[in-house]
């Protein structure tokens, strides 16, 4: 797959951390947010500290997504829920792909047809309701340096 030029981690060796990012969802302009209690949603506030995310390359094209302030890892659960866990599990890895429109998608490595996605209201979308071509799965990585 193509690799993100700015926001992706796919071109970097395993264990490599890039600068913190904010993931901007095309569907409504929400930034992906990881709360300290493990909840995941979207917010339209660039100053929210919980949108600062660390993308770490596990292997080429595979990343984990950690909320810097929450100190938790984004996870796709077997029922399609998105939440953030304190420890890295096999549910915390995602295939990162740069799509032709320059947005990234993050597809679960464990549940391979499910994507990280935000609804138009800012709530997360169940993995089981996601699929290719949806605006909800498209994310633009942006710098989170402050």
């Amino acid at each position: 797959p193509a690799l993100p030029e700015d926001g992706g981690s796919g071109a970097f060796p395993p264990g490599h951390f890039k600068d913190p990012k904010r993931l901007y969802c095309k569907n409504g302009g929400f930034f992906l947010r990881i709360h300290p209690d493990g909840r995941v949603d979207g917010v339209r506030e660039k100053s929210d500290p919980h949108i600062k995310l660390q993308l770490q390359a596990e292997e080429r094209g595979v990343v984990s997504i950690k909320g810097v302030c929450a100190n938790r890892y984004l996870a796709m659960k077997e029922d399609g829920r998105l939440l953030a866990s304190k420890c890295v599990t096999d549910e915390c890895f995602f295939f990162e792909r740069l799509e032709s429109n320059n947005y990234n998608t993050y597809r679960s490595r464990k549940y391979t047809s499910w994507y990280v996605a935000l609804k138009r209201t800012g709530q997360y979308k169940l993995g089981s309701k996601t699929g290719p071509g949806q605006k909800a799965i498209l994310f633009l990585p942006m710098s989170a340096k402050s």
Epitope: R44, N102, M142, S143
Partner: antibody, heavy 121, light 107 residues
Framework: EVQLVQSGAEVKKPGSSVKVSCKAS????????INWVRQAPGQGLEWIGY????????KYNEKFKGRATITSDKSTSTAYMELSSLRSEDTAVYYC??????????????WGQGTTVTVSS | DIQMTQSPSSLSASVGDRVTITCKAS??????VGWYQQKPGKAPKLLIY???NRYSGVPSRFSGSGSGTDFTLTISSLQPEDFATYYC?????????FGQGTKVEIK
Amino acid sequence: EVQLVQSGAEVKKPGSSVKVSCKASGYTFTNYVINWVRQAPGQGLEWIGYNDPYNDVSKYNEKFKGRATITSDKSTSTAYMELSSLRSEDTAVYYCAKEGGGKYVYAMDSWGQGTTVTVSS
Amino acid sequence: DIQMTQSPSSLSASVGDRVTITCKASQSVSSDVGWYQQKPGKAPKLLIYSGSNRYSGVPSRFSGSGSGTDFTLTISSLQPEDFATYYCQQDYYSPWTFGQGTKVEIK
């Protein structure tokens, strides 16, 4: 081509209300937030708030909370900004502006022509 | 609220001059600053977004730089159509706030 066409100039008495409209065309109205910004004569720009036409959810500058009401009508692709309890300091040009979205994020990339509101007794 | 302080408030320049306008935020706003151009009786127009990115169709003589608290708009070679008022704006913290404007006049 994106167009935002605003309603005409208004002259209002202190204490009354004004409702300015902004009709959008050339894009999918529910995909982008509409901001409202005002400019007093000879002064700078001041953000009032925005409305998301998708679910009619609004966010306000605290300064205008309780006095400004920003709404939208999906069926006519029109955004509205109503300001109540008008005072002379509210005399200004009021602009609607669409957010850019995508790589432009929240930058305002298309603006209405402005509506002059004069508050005078 | 975040204060955006522009300087100078006005300047006189000639066609072909290099013009620099600065904007200082009262606290860090990351790189989330835009620049707008406004001519008398007209609505503002977006020039620069996210600190340093030129908006579609904006001439290359306009450039933006900076992050944190200090931002700059540069016009490399002033053209007759560039005489206008320029505003910086931050959208990092709510409420979004603008600078007071810099009027660029003909010398």
